[in-house]
Interface confidence: low
């Protein structure tokens, strides 16, 4: 890879739709990694400091950002549900964390071309009640 | 997975931190549905997945867009996919 | 901008009637779904029954086959006509449109619905 063109990802949690908490009685959240070169990155939910796999779907497969482009940018979004009564209490934090890897294992950087640190992204959001 | 009760349901979730970033989740539709990409290159909808709530027995599909432009709304972010009509629930305004 | 304005509320008895109105006006052309939302003192805002432009209505359970959902897109009006009312109906009632672009939601300032002997 182009060192010039590596990029970390930009990463943003969005919260669950009163509707569909009112709908389902169920809580989603979306974590969003964007505008990442390469496609090297592993994400993770993590609830009240520790890591979780049940209620977790993540795409199994970065897109394009601008699929015409051999270099394009790359995005990945992933999703957590959990009951909402889980996603209204206050107290529960919920933080996405994605890993990126600045350059493949096949890579090789000089001396003067520092080799990109892994770098951890996170965004994150708190329960919220009614009001 | 078969989808025991399917209840397809567009919702518009907002960024923790900017209210004004939104994505529109596609969830709860059954295995049948097969969900399209944009024709709009500035629209980003991701593959369907499955997502099993291991301590409520419970599975559902679900499908990501999201998009920069001003004129993307969640209520035909779908709209390519052959999903039924009035999925999109909006959310009332916080009366917080 | 689309400005929604409610009326019709107020004071009945439980069994009896009365029609909402939302009169709207601004950039109608925008809205896919009308709907009309309710909250009652400490509870959340919640859904009480919606109608698209292509004519399709949903309905809270708790509403269903009681309360009606329509427009006369002449009088650029919804309405909200309400029979056979509870105590538990009593709440604000608020109009809300959704729109395909940005904002995406608008909402009038509500009306008062209370129903008691």
């Known amino acids: 890879e182009d060192l010039n063109k590596v990029f970390p990802p930009e990463v943003a949690v969005f919260e669950p739709s009163e509707a569909e908490i009112s709908h389902t009685q169920k809580a989603t959240l979306v974590c969003l990694a964007t505008g990442f070169f390469p496609d090297h990155v592993e994400l993770s939910w993590w609830v009240n400091g520790k890591e979780v796999h049940s209620g977790v779907s993540t795409d199994p497969q970065p897109l394009k950002e601008q699929p015409a482009l051999n270099d394009s940018r790359y995005c990945l979004s992933s999703r957590l549900r959990v009951s909402a009564t889980f996603w209204q209490n206050p107290r529960n934090h919920f933080r996405c964390q994605v890993q990126f890897y600045g350059l493949s294992e096949n890579d090789e950087w000089t001396q003067d071309r520092a080799k990109p640190v892994t770098q951890i992204v996170s965004a994150e959001a708190w329960g919220r009640a009614d009001c | 997975p078969n989808i025991q009760n399917p209840d397809p349901a567009v919702y518009q979730l907002r960024d923790s931190k900017s209210s004004d970033k939104s994505v529109c989740l596609f969830t709860d539709f059954d295995s049948q549905t097969n969900v399209s990409q944009s024709k709009d290159s500035d629209v980003y909808i991701t593959d369907k997945t499955v997502l099993d709530m291991r301590s409520m027995d419970f599975k559902s599909n679900s499908a990501v867009a999201w998009s920069n432009k001003s004129d993307f709304a969640c209520a035909n972010a779908f709209n390519n996919s052959i999903i039924p009509e009035d999925t999109f629930f909006p959310s009332p305004e916080s009366s917080c | 901008e689309v400005q929604l304005v409610e009326s019709g509320g107020g004071l009945v008895q439980p069994g009896g009637s009365l029609r909402l109105s939302c009169i709207t006006s601004g950039e109608t052309f925008k809205i896919n779904i009308w709907g009309w939302y309710r909250q009652a003192p400490g509870k959340q805002r919640e859904l009480v029954a919606s109608?698209?432009?292509?004519?399709?209505?949903n309905y809270a359970d708790s509403v269903k086959g009681r309360f009606t959902i329509s427009e006369d897109s002449a009088k650029n009006t919804v309405y909200l006509q309400m029979n056979s009312l509870k105590p538990e109906d009593t709440a604000v009632y608020f109009c809300?449109?959704?729109?395909?672009?940005?904002?995406?939601?608008?909402w009038g300032r509500g009306t008062q619905v209370t129903v008691s002997s």
């Open positions: 809300n449109a959704k729109s395909r672009i940005y904002p995406y939601d608008y």
């Open positions: 109608l698209t432009i292509g004519g399709a209505t």
